[in-house]
Structures are given as C-alpha cells and as structure tokens.
C-alpha cells in the first residue's frame, strides 16, 4: 500500500526537484503542531505568531491577549505558566539544558491583576524546577536540590528540604538514571489535587559510582563533568517519598510515605506518583529484577498526621515471560470513586489491554481485547473512557483515539478518528479539556499533519487549528519518495516494514539498500507518520530505498514478540533486520553489492553486530553513539531487558552481545562509527572501546567524534554528522558527488 | 485632559450593600489598572484593592476579601467597586486611581490620576 | 505588608521657608535589577483627591513646580518644599509601590506658621 503517492506527471516532471541535503539541514518541510495549553473546560491559552499570550473561549468564540510580548520581551522569556486563579503569570528565560529533560532557568513572576512584575521576595536563580499549584497561586520550586514553598508570589519562602547537595541528594527532582530511564521528567514533585499536600522524592546517591568525562570547552584546561550513573549492576540510588501539608508545613513537616513490605526487602525503585484526592494517594514500586510491580494505595490519617498504606490496597503486577509493562509499568486512571482505576496491562493471551481494577488484580474487568494493543489512556470522565490503540485495520503502526461509553452497559465502544481523513490520518494523539468538555486531536501522518478542535460530546470538529498550508504549498514542487507499510511472515513472525522508494521508482531497476535500524525494547520505528528526513532526501536525490523493520523486542504487537528477546539483548534484533534483507533481495529490486545499514543509539549497537554477523550482506555501515556492551549502560534500562551482570544471573550473555567480541568480522565492511564525546547517556567509552577492540585486531575502521556533544550530537554538529554519512554512504555505493 | 468620574454619595444601612462606578475619558483604558482607595474621617489612605481591563482580573487586599468585588465594563471604559456587609467604620471617601501597566520588568508606576472621591455613609 | 511611619504628623512653616517630611518603610523599596525606589508623594487638599507629585522616590510628575523635590532611597525617604508658598497648604502622603498591598503613610499636615 503506498501511503504517500509522489505527485509526478510527466507533464510536471520538468518543474519539480528533489530533496537536498540543505533542505533537512535548514528543516526546510518541518511541519507545526497545535497543542492547546487548555486551562479550563473550555478555555485554552496559545501563544500567538507575533508571541502575545492569548486566551481562547470556545463557547463564546472570544479571545484576548492575556500577557503582551512586550512583558514577554522584556525578560526574554520562551515559556511560560499562568497560575490556576489566573492572576500570575511565570515567565522562564535563561533557560540552560542539563539531560534530556532537565534543565535550569531564571522565573519571573508577573501579576495579570496589577499588570507589573512582582517584586520583593524573589525567586532565587537558577531553578531546577517551578510549578504552581493546581488551584490558587501556591509556588513550588526546587533551588540547589532543595524544596521551596510559596504560598504567593510575593511572599518570604518556606524551605521544606535541607539536606539537597549537588550530585548527593536530590529533592523533588531526579538524578540521572530516574531522569532518563523511569520518571521520564524533570521533576519528582506532586500536588495533590487541591494543593493541600505536596509529595516529592528523595533521592540518596551517595553511594553510586562516578561517570566522568571532559568537557573541553575554550579554557586552557578541560572541564571534568561527574555525573553519579549507576552501570548494570552497580549500587543505585535510594528513594523516598514524602508528602507536606502546604497549608501547614511547619506543623508536622514532611512525612515518609512507607513502601510495600514485599518490595522493601531487596533493592528497588518507585516509579509513578498519582493524587486520586487530596487525602489519597497512589505510587508504584517496583523490584530492581524489574518483574514484578507493586501498586499501593495510600490514605491521609488527620488523628496522626500520617500516610497509610494497608496491605489490601495493594495491587502486584508481575510478569513471568518478561519484564513488568512496556517500556515503563503503565500509570493507573482513577475513576470517580477514588478507589478503582483503569491500567493498561498483559491479558491472559498476551496483548497489553485496558483493565478495570475494582478490588483485587485478579478480579480485573477486561475492557479491551483483541490481538492489537491499547496504547494509551487519555482521559475518564463519568461516562467515557479515552484511548488510543493500534486496532484499526490491523496495522500495528497506526494510532487511532476511541471513546468507550462506561456510563452505559454494555459498554458501547467508537472510533472516533478512524474515519475522519482516512489516507491524510492514521496516526493521532490527543489532548483533553477539564471533563473532556473539548478535545484536540494533533494527526502526525501519514499525510501532512493536521491538528483539530472538537466537541468532546458529540465528537464533531470545531475547527483546525494547524494544517500546515505553508508546507503543503512548499512541497507541491518536491519530488518526495514514496513510502510503503507492509509486512512479511517469517518462521511464524510477523516483520512489518516501512519502505521508502525513490519518486521515479522502476522494480525492473535495481537500487542500493540502507537499513535504518532503532530495534531497541519496546520501541516501534514503523510508524504512519509524516516526515521529510535524512532518508527522505536520500531516496528522492541520491536514489536508495531505505527500509526501517520492525523485529522481535519492538512494541504494541503482543508479549510474545515484545518479550522474545528478554535476557537476550543483541540477538533477535539482529537476525531480524538481516532476515527482512534477505526477503527485500528476493524481491528483486535491490543491488545486493550495496545494501548498509546504520542506527543510533541502541540502532548503533544493532547496526554494529549487524555488520559484524558475519553474512556478507553489507557492504557498509555506520554506528551513532553506539552502546557497545551492556555493562556500560544504565542499570535500570539494562538490568530491566538483560537482569544482572553476575555469575548466578547472566553475566555469561553481558560478555556474548558485545560489539568488541565481534571486532575480526569487521574485515571485510566499511564501518564508521560517531559519537559525542560528552554523551551523558551512551557514554564515550562505549566507542573507546569499540575503537580499541579493532585496533587491536587491526581492522581498518572510518571514526568521527564530536568534541562536547552529546547523545543528540546537536545544532553545527548535526550538519556535519549527516554531510559526513551522506558522503560515506555515497562512496560506499559508488554513487557520484 | 483625563477624566475619573465616581458616581454620587450613598447612605446605606449597616449590613447592605454599596456599588460605586468610576467611568474614565480621554485615555486608552486598556492601558492603565484601576485601583480603589478609601479614606475614613481622619484616617490615612486605605488601597482596597484593583483590576485589570485587560483580564478583569482583580487583586484584593486581604483585609477586604470576601467583601468587596471590582469589576470593569470595557465597553463604557468604567470600573465598579462593590463593598458588601457594611458596617459604620466603612464610612469613608472612596476613590479610583488609575495606574499605568508595567509591559516591562523594570517598569513600575504611581497612581498618576484619581477620581474626585464618591462618600459612602453607613448609619443606622 | 509593608508599613509606612511619617515624620512629622504636622508641620508649620513660614511662607517661603523649606519644608522637610520624612517617610520611613518597614522594608526596603530600592528594587536591586533597576536601583530605582518604588516610593511616591502625593499631596491632598482638602475636599480633594490626593494628587501625585514625586514617583519613584524623586522624579517630578509633570506640572508639578520644582520646588518640589524627593529624596531617599531604601528605607528612608524625604519631600523637601523649597520655599512654601501659600497652595502648598496640604496634607501629604508617601505611599510605596513595591509589593502589594500597596500602603500609605499616615499624611503629614503642611500648614503656615
């Protein structure tokens, strides 16, 4: 099936071009998104081309400009937060990156009543974190790994931690491995509903061993960055959670919220907080052997000023072919009652599923069945459910939103985007309202993307809020390559694949192959979305096919293919992408003497093993920031797919997946291997020790790194990274300059 | 020149309700907040609180919150202060100020302008 | 909240001799990212809205004569009348801006002596 139809004619053929590599390098066809910062049931704030602050009333159809970008301008502000009683406005500037998701900044506060910024008891800087509470105008923030508390904008701070230390003790915010591997956020703090509690973690790591790199930066000598980074197996952080009574928080101070018995009595992490009232509360734990999750519900006693968290409310989530969840353990939706909830977890055959958990696990209501999977819970009010699955038609790569009516029995299920533009839109989010009163759907593709507002009764559209005129008038003269999903059946696997062609695509011609690979656990890279990309351009001007396959270990096809390769990270991955070769040779179109591959990441390490299979498949490949040997990763990722680096566990496959046991089956492929050197994630070293492993075997290897770039090798180190590839791919398939 | 116009003087009873009304000229309404100031027979200058045309959101002093509520009607260019649960000692002059926007951090003005002052009596 | 202390509550001056009215803040008015003292003057007669004189500590608002001037910067703050004339019987209020609620002194009466 071809999703996205080049619009050659012969007659138009003479005014159309093709990509270029300046193209992508500029984002030239970057498309834009509407994601309304919704503050109400009906109301949303955007901020307008000219950078005004607007607030927009669907039921009445007015809008008007909360905050001038004058007052935007005049602290040079790129973001910014209105409090829940709509009287201050956080403006953040000096905004400075940190990991992936954490970063410092300078906040101000300024008043909407009295129209001038607040002063008098200023927000310290830099800050870590800053959020208001979600009625009223309180301040939470985090400065130098401590927590403040504001109960207004102007007033003196109460300090609510004292023990936060840089690299030690974090509170309210994550260290690096909760940052980037459990949390996903960059902040550990959580008001409940009203703003009564305020819960944060703690988060000791005083005893995790040091990742240290150079950062070189102009001086005379270089910088070194420390970061604590527990490798698989090494000691982790420990966690605690407390919750403060904000209204009072000099009375009884925080109080520690006690963690499962079962889960206490070895190593673990905590990984999700959930308000369900301003005196309930719900976290999840989970073991270090990350298969079995706890889920524990906590109630406020007034006579003790404490947390308590009965063992009946206590709810396991174990798995016994793989891990526990997807890539994280799903997070619960509470419906009205306070006390049962939805999630998203296993059914008996295997497919992750919607749940209706009323007192036990195992007295679980089945809400969604079927051999696709429901991906994402939006939003439950009284009588609906909102989610997206990948069920319609079959395709795995597809993201549709349903609604199921839970007011009603039997509970009547609709799609409520599979039919709206049907070859522009098969792979949507959403975004909700208070009550789900309006929703946004934000469609990524496979057609331009196109974001639209809708009525969250009826389901009608409203109006579009983006759809990307600009570019659909900037690609009317491009000659874009055309894209197929499909599958292929092999030994009782399901591969399905995404090919991009080139726009004069002629099957009785044969054309060079580029693999691009992620493959990494739970992840999915063929997907039905939009995108003019590196590949994009290499298809339409330099006439490759590229292919991306989706093999064993990728997501939202079932336990089975998920978890086939659970403590056997390196393997199944590999032989899949070389399979999916094999079968796209027979198809007879490709050049067999120019077929590479290359990845990022967890697709460097595949990419690696992949040239290194010994095959003869390819001719050539390229590995960016690579991990090279799991015990160079971070515990909780790896120990989460491989277990542990001991003798009693699986050291013995730790030693068998890595790249450097492979060096001597580099001979015979032209390899060239990238990375930052000041890659926080997938640390240098990784490709220290690929580049040791082929000297020593002396194999002759291509290598570029980027001096104080990261895991994203961005901004001047983007363009160079994708000339330098364009130009090794080239040459490795011949193709003239 | 800028005009504040208040509306006339008011007797009330103790426990009723007053709403005075401040209707302004001869400048860009959006532009300045309206703020209220009452002053009691030989008492200093009291801020009650102010609003902001823009938003209409209005920003109290504590003392009266829950008593009092300010408004604004855009369309007239007129600001309204309503004092609920009088009592005698809320005999006073009340007055409406305007006071410039500050669009920049560094800004921060004076109430530059006022009204000529509405006097609410609270007798039994 | 901020409070304001005048000093004197009254003063009598001979026409054409220099009045001195202090103003004291509980905390400081100086704002450290522009050094400007968020503090103004106003000036009321009586049966009339007060009228503002002196922002930001001591910039003349427009119109008003120069020997009206302002001083002071933190806590401590002065109007000083050059040379008292005859419609410069008043009473006088500092007030500060710098948080909310905003705040008066308690006035201080300007006669002729």
């Known amino acids: 099936i071809v999703l996205r139809p080049s619009r050659v004619h012969n007659s138009e053929e003479n005014t159309m071009r093709a990509l270029t590599l300046k193209d992508i390098l500029n984002g030239t066809f970057s498309y834009k998104t509407f994601f309304p910062n919704w503050i109400s049931g009906q109301e949303y704030l955007h901020q307008s081309a000219d950078n005004n602050i607007v607030l927009y009333n669907i039921e009445t159809g007015q809008s008007y400009t909360i905050l001038s970008n004058r007052t935007m301008k005049s602290v040079n502000a790129s973001n910014y937060g209105l409090s829940p009683d709509r009287q201050f406005v956080y403006l953040e500037s000096d905004y400075s990156k940190l990991w992936r998701y954490s970063y410092t900044a300078t906040y101000y506060i300024y008043d909407l009543s009295n129209g001038e910024f607040v002063r008098g008891n200023e927000l310290p800087r830099p800050i870590q974190y800053l959020c208001w509470s979600p009625v009223g105008s309180k301040l939470a923030y985090v400065y130098q790994n401590n927590i403040y508390l504001k109960q207004r904008p102007g007033d003196p701070p109460f300090q609510i931690t004292f023990n936060g230390r840089e690299n030690k003790i974090f509170n309210g915010i994550p260290d690096w491995v909760y940052e980037e591997e459990m949390l996903a956020t960059k902040y550990a703090l959580w008001w409940s509903p009203n703003g009564k509690f305020l819960a944060y973690a703690e988060f000791n790591d005083t005893d995790i061993p040091v990742i240290a790199y150079s950062y070189y930066g102009d001086e005379q000598y270089p910088r070194t960055i420390n970061i604590p980074y527990p490798k698989a197996g090494a000691k982790n952080p420990v966690v605690r959670i407390f919750i403060i009574d904000t209204t009072y928080p000099a009375y009884v101070g925080p109080q520690e919220v006690p963690v499962p018995a079962m889960i206490a009595s070895s190593d673990y992490y905590f990984s999700w907080l959930t308000w369900v009232t301003d005196e309930r509360v719900c976290l999840q734990w989970l073991k270090r052997v990350q298969n079995v999750s706890v889920l524990s519900i906590c109630d406020f006693r007034e006579d003790w000023q404490t947390w308590d968290c009965p063992k009946t409310q206590e709810h396991i989530e174990e798995s016994r072919t793989g891990w526990a969840g997807g890539f994280f353990v799903s997070t619960p939706v509470f419906s009205y009652d306070a006390i049962s909830y939805y999630k998203i977890f296993s059914d008996k055959d295997g497919y992750k599923h919607i749940h209706y958990i009323k007192d036990t696990v195992e007295n679980a209501i089945q809400i969604t069945s079927g051999k696709w999977e429901a991906i994402n819970i939006f939003r439950v009010t009284q009588d609906s459910l909102f989610y997206s699955s990948n069920e319609f038609e079959e395709y795995p790569g597809r993201r549709n939103i349903y609604r199921i009516s839970i007011g009603s029995y039997p509970p009547s299920k609709k799609c409520v985007t599979c039919h709206l533009r049907k070859e522009r839109c098969q792979y949507y989010t959403a975004s909700f309202s208070d009550y789900a009163k309006y929703y946004a759907l934000v469609c990524y593709g496979p057609g331009i993307p196109i974001s639209t507002l809708h009525d969250g009764r009826t389901d009608q559209e409203i109006k579009i809020l983006e759809e990307n005129k600009e570019l659909e008038n900037a690609l009317k003269n491009i000659q874009l390559p055309k894209e197929e999903i499909k599958k292929l059946e092999v030994d009782e696997i399901t591969l399905w694949y995404k090919m991009i062609l080139p726009p004069q695509f002629d099957r009785s011609k044969k054309y060079p192959l580029l693999i691009q690979v992620y493959g990494g656990p739970c992840s999915q890279s063929v997907r039905s979305v939009f995108a003019v990309n590196w590949i994009s351009y290499l298809a339409s001007k330099e006439g490759m096919v590229i292919a991306l396959v989706d093999g064993r270990g990728t997501a939202f096809q079932g336990d089975k293919l998920l978890y086939a390769v659970y403590r056997k990270l390196g393997v199944y991955e590999v032989e899949d992408q070389i399979t999916a070769v094999r079968k796209f040779i027979e198809m007879g179109f490709i050049d067999e003497k120019r077929i590479a591959i290359w990845g990022w990441s967890y697709g460097g390490y595949v990419s690696s093993l992949a040239l290194a299979s010994g095959t003869g498949l390819f001719k050539c490949g390229i590995a960016v920031a690579p991990v090279s040997s799991w015990e160079y990763y971070a515990s909780v990722y790896t120990e989460r797919f491989m277990g542990l680096p001991t003798k009693d566990d699986n050291l013995e496959h730790y030693k068998n997946s890595t790249v450097m046991a492979r060096a001597e089956y580099f001979r015979n492929v032209d390899y060239l291997l990238i990375h930052g050197t000041a890659d926080d994630n997938v640390h240098f070293q990784n490709s220290a020790q690929i580049a040791k492993a082929l000297v020593n075997a002396q194999v002759d290897f291509q290598a570029m790194w980027y001096s104080d770039q990261n895991h994203g090798l961005s901004g001047l180190s983007t363009n160079h990274l994708y000339t330098h590839m364009t130009h090794f791919l080239k040459q490795c398939f011949s193709l003239s300059d | 020149q800028v005009q504040l116009v208040q509306s006339g003087a008011e007797v009330k009873k103790p426990g009723a309700s007053v709403k005075v009304s401040c209707k302004t000229s001869?400048?860009?309404?959006?532009?300045?907040?309206i703020h209220w100031v009452r002053q009691a027979p030989g008492q200093r200058l009291e801020w009650i609180g102010g609003?902001?045309?823009?938003?209409?959101?209005?920003n109290y002093n504590q003392k009266f919150k829950g008593r009092v509520t300010i408004t604004v009607d855009t369309s007239a260019s007129t600001a309204y202060m309503e004092l609920s649960s009088l009592r005698s000692e809320d005999t006073a002059v009340y007055y409406c100020?305007?006071?410039?926007?500050?669009?920049?951090?560094?800004?921060?003005?004076?109430?530059?302008?006022w009204g000529q002052g509405t006097l609410v009596t609270v007798s039994s | 909240d901020i409070v304001m202390t005048q000093s004197p509550d009254s003063l009598a001056v001979s026409l054409g001799e220099r009045a001195t009215i202090n103003c004291k803040s509980s905390?400081?008015?100086?704002?450290?990212?522009?050094?400007?003292?968020?503090l103004a003057w106003y000036q009321q007669k009586p049966g009339q809205p007060p009228k503002l004189l002196i922002f930001?500590?001591?910039t003349r608002e427009s119109g008003v004569p120069d020997r009206f001037s302002g001083s002071g910067f933190g806590t401590d703050f002065t109007l000083t009348i050059s040379s008292l004339q005859a419609e410069d019987v008043a009473v006088y209020y500092c007030?500060?801006?710098?948080?909310?609620?905003?705040?008066f002194g308690q006035g201080t009466k300007v006669e002729i002596k």
């Open positions: 100020a305007r006071r410039r926007i500050a669009y920049g951090y560094d800004e921060g003005h004076a109430m530059d302008y």
């Open positions: 001869r400048y860009t309404f959006t532009e300045y907040t």
């Open positions: 609003i902001n045309p823009n938003n209409g959101i209005p």
């Open positions: 905390q400081s008015l100086l704002y450290s990212r522009n050094q400007q003292n968020y």
């Open positions: 930001w500590a001591s």
């Open positions: 007030q500060q801006y710098f948080s909310y609620p905003l705040t």
